[in-house]
Interface confidence: medium
Amino acid sequence: EEELQVIQPDKSVLVAAGETATLRCTATSLIPVGPIQWFRGAGPGRELIYNQKEGHFPRVTTVSDLTKRNNMDFSIRIGNITPADAGTYYCVKFRKGSPDDVEFKSGAGTELSVRAKPSAPVVSGPAARATPQHTVSFTCESHGFSPRDITLKWFKNGNELSDFQTNVDPVGESVSYSIHSTAKVVLTREDVHSQVICEVAHVTLQGDPLRGTANLSETIRVPPTLEVTQQPVRAENQVNVTCQVRKFYPQRLQLTWLENGNVSRTETASTVTENKDGTYNWMSWLLVNVSAHRDDVKLTCQVEHDGQPAVSKSHDLKVSAHPKEQGSNTAAENTGSNERNIY
């Protein structure tokens, strides 16, 4: 009778993560009597995957009954495959021996490759906000995919970006891979509503790429423009001065009025109006009782936006042209929601 051969007909098997891998193995003879074992890898460091005689292998099932004496099909199924299961699997026939069974013959091996989907791309922007005309970096990361081939693209509002660098790690063979990409984006004043998108395409995604997004609203800071104007006289001795704070983002803003360098009033932007581009406008006004002043008044609108150094705009109010009303000591009056006198 011909000597037993162990046949592993599949040189390689490709399985998607989470699915079941079938590793085929048949023997050409029933002799010698002895059990079969499956290993991953060869040599002294090989890992036991299945032993029909002993051990607990909850993920492994046999295709046929390996303990049946005339069975020559030693194929196994491994359930819930993960990238960590990738490797070369050997079906090894043992000969019954005393006290231990003796390795008799091995199959040629079957390489198990695992197709694993990349994780959802995570896009991160810079830690600090930046202003228009500045270049900021965005990173995109995705992990756990296999095989290594992967395509990554960057978009800003649907327009593909070209200024980026991408690395897939590790460089050598691995059970799974990670991708890391950094894109450079130049901010504009209109970017409050803009999005940066990282798109990852992989064989496991069947033409339906994964996307990660970052809203530039979390990255951009649009500093305000200030305009201080003197409104027509409301009453004989009163002048209404307004400070228009335009096109700023984010909303966090504090405004201080100064009269000749002295703080008159401080308020926080609350009831703002939103522009189509996502930036905000706000207006504050000051009622100045000119009769309280003998000399010209320098009114300054000072704005601290989003924790940045204050910017200011001044307006010189000429008081000589206005007759002074005796007995009044009110220099300015807030006509906003919280009316109060500043002395």
């Epitope: 029909q52 005689k53 009954d65 303990t67 005339n70």
Partner: antibody, heavy 122, light 107 residues
């Protein structure tokens, strides 16, 4: 000494149920496939069911499939046969038997119990 | 299912006689055939496994031969304690099947 002792037989009405047990001793029970074989009064031997050592592989005769369930508890060194929907033709002496070789089956039955009698009658 | 046809169903022989029982399988079963002895009121006992191998402790007057579909069981010199029914059994495939048995009596 290798020994198998069956129990659980008795008189039962048609349609009724019985659970047979087989207590094993004198060998490493978990390493051996086990069988149930029956013999109707004055008749020959009829194989009923087998269970491998794992026990991932189970086999039944067509005459009992869907009605009988073989199981084992390796921790208790015990083999069981749950018999439901019993019929008059299930009346027999039921033997449990072990395979001669550990981890393998298909070599036969080298040790038998003394048998337990099941009578199905109204 | 594999059918096992055993003959004769019964025989009577004298002490010291050579007794032969045959068993025919309905399909090739290689050498996956065992022979059992069952004495009245007792459990069966394995005598021969794999068609021709004598089980440990079984007297050498018992022997078996054959392969494929045709098998023979022989008692070279019948003894009084050999009074029993003998069964062949195939183990090539499930369901396991037994022959109908041969009842051996002393003349």
């Amino acid at each position: 000494e290798v020994q198998l002792v069956e129990s659980g037989g008795g008189l039962v009405k048609p349609g009724g149920s019985l659970r047979l047990s087989c207590a094993a001793s004198g060998f490493t029970f978990s390493s051996y496939s086990m069988h149930w074989v029956r013999q109707a009064p004055g008749k020959g031997l009829e194989w009923v069911s087998s269970i491998s050592s794992s026990p991932s592989h189970i086999y039944y005769a067509d005459s009992v499939k869907g009605r009988f369930t073989i199981s084992r508890d390796n921790a208790k060194n015990s083999l069981y046969l749950q018999m439901n929907s019993l019929r008059a033709e299930d009346t027999a002496v039921y033997y449990c038997a072990k395979e001669p070789r550990s981890y393998w089956h298909g070599y036969g039955m080298d040790v038998w119990g003394q048998g337990t009698t099941v009578t199905v009658s109204s | 299912d594999i059918q096992m046809t055993q003959s004769p169903s019964s025989l009577s022989a004298s002490v010291g006689d050579r007794v032969t029982i045959t068993c025919q399988a309905s399909q090739d079963i290689s050498n996956y055939l065992n022979w059992y002895q069952q004495k009245p009121g007792k459990a069966p006992k394995l005598l021969i496994y794999d068609a021709s191998n004598l089980e440990t402790g079984v007297p050498s007057r018992f022997s078996g031969s054959g392969s494929g579909t045709d098998f023979t069981f022989t008692i070279s010199s019948l003894q009084p304690e050999d009074i029993a029914t003998y069964y062949c059994q195939q183990l090539s495939n499930y369901p396991i099947t037994f022959g109908g048995g041969t009842k051996v009596e002393i003349k």
